[in-house]
């Protein structure tokens, strides 16, 4: 660590005095101190002499000697006071710039340590400090305003009591800059815009920041627009607004609009798209298939997407039949707006009943006219089966009728013993009927098919079973011949109860 001679922490001299400060180290040494006149520097290897033969108040300050080659970076310091009765202050800088919440050092150095008791900090023209100004004083360094605020950006003077009167320093301008967290915040309204050619439109681009130094502009398809800026200050933020008013839009006004703001922290931008159309439009679509099949008892939501400009003047869901004249309950229909020009309309159909199959139409109207989108809802049913014994053209025939949706497939089984349902161990014979006769097949209704099994002689200790199945489920009917005639057995429990 270098050593300074004289080896005192502070040295007090009068103006005009000769001052010699000598620094000795192991290697070469360097002096650092306030920029002031009349100093002479003489270096000789490991020592360096700083001297003046005419000290002035401007030489007041802390002089530090460092040894650049020292890996520990040690230093020694001495503070020099040049006590001038006419000049109690040596101001090292007339402008101090800090960020908010930093400590701001106003470097007015006292030239006489004796005056420390009577020092104070004031604003220029003798005005008192702002309330809540928290500061401290060091005769070596000056006044420190702790955690400086933007509002404390003022011109200050250091005051010392000399012979009963206050003597002021020259003024120091403090600039407290707001801490800018990032580029300005932006809003571009609306987020999307559609207009018919000839209509009026407005696009508003606004940016705000804690600091006034930022730029904002609105551009259309990369062309910067000439819009007079409107400025404001509220909620402790500076706001700059650009309003684009188009009295009569045309196709060349369409396209991409970007609101761009920048400051020292960087750039922010946000965009919107402006569509200009020739006339009103109304488009209905659905992500769902317009032909829907649902199992009876289950629920279904029908969804329609509407894209329209101008807005809808009316809309409703209508049941077009064929079963009843009931209409969907309004409480089951709801609308959600995705954005200004796109909406989703949903019709909820919970626990569907047979009478609710059919056509459902969504109708919407705007100045562009009426549009409709129709869904066809068919209900799926598991098969219901019945078997009867009859004679056709003199031959004994088992006749199986199965109805359900989708169209059921029919399989005949012959099994030993009397049973409600043939199991694998009992099965003697199986017949698949690939083409049962379709008895009825109307839209939105069940399909009824009929299958015939010609039996020359009914075996009395056997069971004949008709099984029908489709994608929803299966149904069966067991036919048990008895000597006195024939006996039919429906299954123990029906799979479906309408």
């Amino acid at each position: 660590i270098p050593v300074i001679e004289p080896s005192v922490p502070e040295l007090v001299v009068k103006p005009g005095a000769t001052v010699t400060l000598r620094c000795v180290g192991n290697g070469s040494v360097e002096w650092d101190g306030p920029p002031s006149p009349h100093w002479t520097l003489y270096s000789d290897g490991s020592s360096s002499i700083l001297s003046t033969n005419n000290a002035t108040f401007q030489n007041t300050g802390t002089y530090r000697c460092t040894e650049p080659g020292d890996p520990l970076g040690g230093s020694a310091a001495i503070h020099l006071y040049v006590k001038d009765p006419a000049r109690p202050w040596n101001v090292l800088a007339q402008e101090v710039v800090v960020f908010e919440d930093q400590d701001a050092l106003l470097p007015c150095l006292l030239t006489d340590p004796v005056l420390e008791a009577g020092v104070s900090l004031v604003r220029v023209r003798g005005r008192p400090l702002m309330r809540h100004t928290n500061y401290s004083f060091s005769p070596w360094h000056g006044f420190t305003i702790h955690r400086a605020k933007f509002i404390q950006s003022q011109d200050y003077q250091c005051s010392a009591l000399m012979g009963g009167r206050k003597v002021m320093s020259i003024s120091i301008r403090l600039k407290v800059q707001k801490v800018i967290p990032g580029p300005p915040a932006l809003t571009l309204v609306p987020a999307e815009l559609v207009r018919i050619r000839g209509e009026a439109a407005q696009i508003v681009c606004s940016a705000s920041s804690v600091d006034v130094n930022f730029d904002v502009f609105l551009q259309h398809n990369n062309t910067k627009l000439a819009i007079p800026q409107q400025s404001d200050f509220h909620n402790n933020r500076y706001q700059k607004v650009l309003t684009l008013n188009l009295d009569q839009v045309d196709f060349q006004h369409a396209g991409n609009y970007s609101c761009v703001a920048s400051n020292v922290q960087g750039k922010h931008s946000t965009s919107m798209f402006f569509r200009v159309v020739e006339s009103a439009y109304l488009n209905l679509s659905s992500e769902q298939n317009l032909i829907q099949e649902v199992t009876v008892g289950e629920g279904l939501n029908l969804k329609v997407m509407v894209e329209a400009y101008p807005g809808l003047q009316g809309f409703n869901w209508t049941y077009l039949g064929p079963f009843s004249d009931h209409q969907p309950e309004p409480k089951l229909a709801n609308a959600t707006t995705k954005d200004t020009y796109r909406h989703t309309f949903t019709l909820s159909l919970p626990r569907l009943k047979p009478s609710e199959a059919g056509r459902y139409s969504f109708l919407a109207r705007n100045p562009g006219g009426w549009r409709a989108l129709t869904f066809e809802l068919t209900l799926r049913y598991p098969p219901e089966v019945s078997v009867i014994w009859t004679f056709i053209n003199g031959s004994g025939t088992l006749l199986c009728a199965a109805s359900g949706y989708p169209q059921p497939n029919v399989t005949w089984l012959q099994c030993s013993g009397h049973t409600d349902r043939c199991d694998e161990a009992q099965v003697l014979q199986v017949w698949d009927d690939p083409y049962p006769e379709v008895l009825s097949q109307e839209p939105f209704h069940k399909v009824t098919v009929q299958s015939l099994l010609t039996v020359e002689t009914l075996e009395h200790n056997q069971t004949y079973e008709c099984r029908a199945h489709n994608s929803v489920g299966s149904g069966s009917w067991a036919f048990i011949p008895i000597s006195a005639g024939a006996h039919t057995h429906p299954p123990d429990e029906f799979l479906f109860t309408p």
Epitope: H220, T223, L225, A226, I227, P228, Q229, Q230, S231, T243, L244, N245, D247, Q252
Partner: antibody, heavy 118, light 110 residues
């Protein structure tokens, strides 16, 4: 409809000042920059400067810096152009023009003739 | 001395097509759009073409504009006697933060 109506003709002596007004109607006055352009007899168009009616901010052509002052009164949707220390070569027709967003002057005042003569 | 350069005069007979050129620099025409103004004798200038090639409503489609690099041109087809006027080109100049004009071209219909 959108229009700009300027004050009447002026005759001034060299060294004097002239203040020309331009009243806007049919649109939002603060929504567009107002420019001033002059045309000396038999000469072309010469841009003088613009004013932002919103903020009062201005930008003057180098040639007129120090001699021209552009102001506005938003309460009556009027822009003003004052030219001081008039010389004989300031004799011209002075136009105010609305600057449309795409940097074109889409609406012009009818013009104010200023004659500078001793 | 105008910033944009135009020929001082042009002429044509009725029905003919005439073209007026306008040249500038990178700070004006090179980086911004060009506008054309028509000034009939004793009247204020009127916007004729904006954004290089767009016509305001009411301007006949006989008038068309184009731009390439630092030059632009105005074409008038099917020349009519009422087209006799002064034509000015103009463009925003980034270095001035204001518009610059051409010296004007006097069009005579012979």
């Amino acid at each position: 409809q959108v229009q700009l109506v300027q004050s009447g003709a002026e005759v001034k002596k060299p060294g004097a000042s002239v203040k020309v007004s331009c009243k806007a109607s049919g649109y939002t006055f603060t929504g567009y920059y107002m420019h001033w352009v002059r045309q000396a007899p038999g000469q072309g168009l010469e841009w003088m400067g613009w004013i932002n009616p919103n903020s009062g901010g201005t930008n003057y052509a180098q040639k007129f810096q120090g001699r021209v002052t552009m102001t506005r009164d938003t309460s009556i949707s009027t822009a003003y152009m004052e030219l001081s220390r008039l010389r004989s070569d300031d004799t011209a027709v002075y136009y105010c023009a609305r600057l449309y967003y795409y940097y074109n002057m889409d609406v012009w005042g009818q013009g104010t003739t200023v004659t500078v003569s001793s | 001395q105008s910033v944009l350069t135009q020929p001082p005069s042009a002429s044509g007979t009725p029905g003919q097509r005439v073209t007026i050129s306008c040249s500038g620099s990178s700070s004006n025409i090179g980086s911004n759009t060009v506008n054309w103004y028509q000034q009939l004798p004793g009247t204020a200038p009127k916007l004729l073409i904006y954004s290089n090639n767009q016509r305001p409503s009411g301007v006949p489609d006989r008038f068309s504009g184009s731009k390439s690099g630092t030059s632009a041109s105005l074409a008038i087809s099917g020349l009519q006697s009422e087209d006799e006027a002064d034509y000015y080109c103009a463009a925003w100049d980034d270095s001035l933060n204001g518009p610059v004009f051409g010296g004007g071209t006097k069009l005579t219909v012979l």
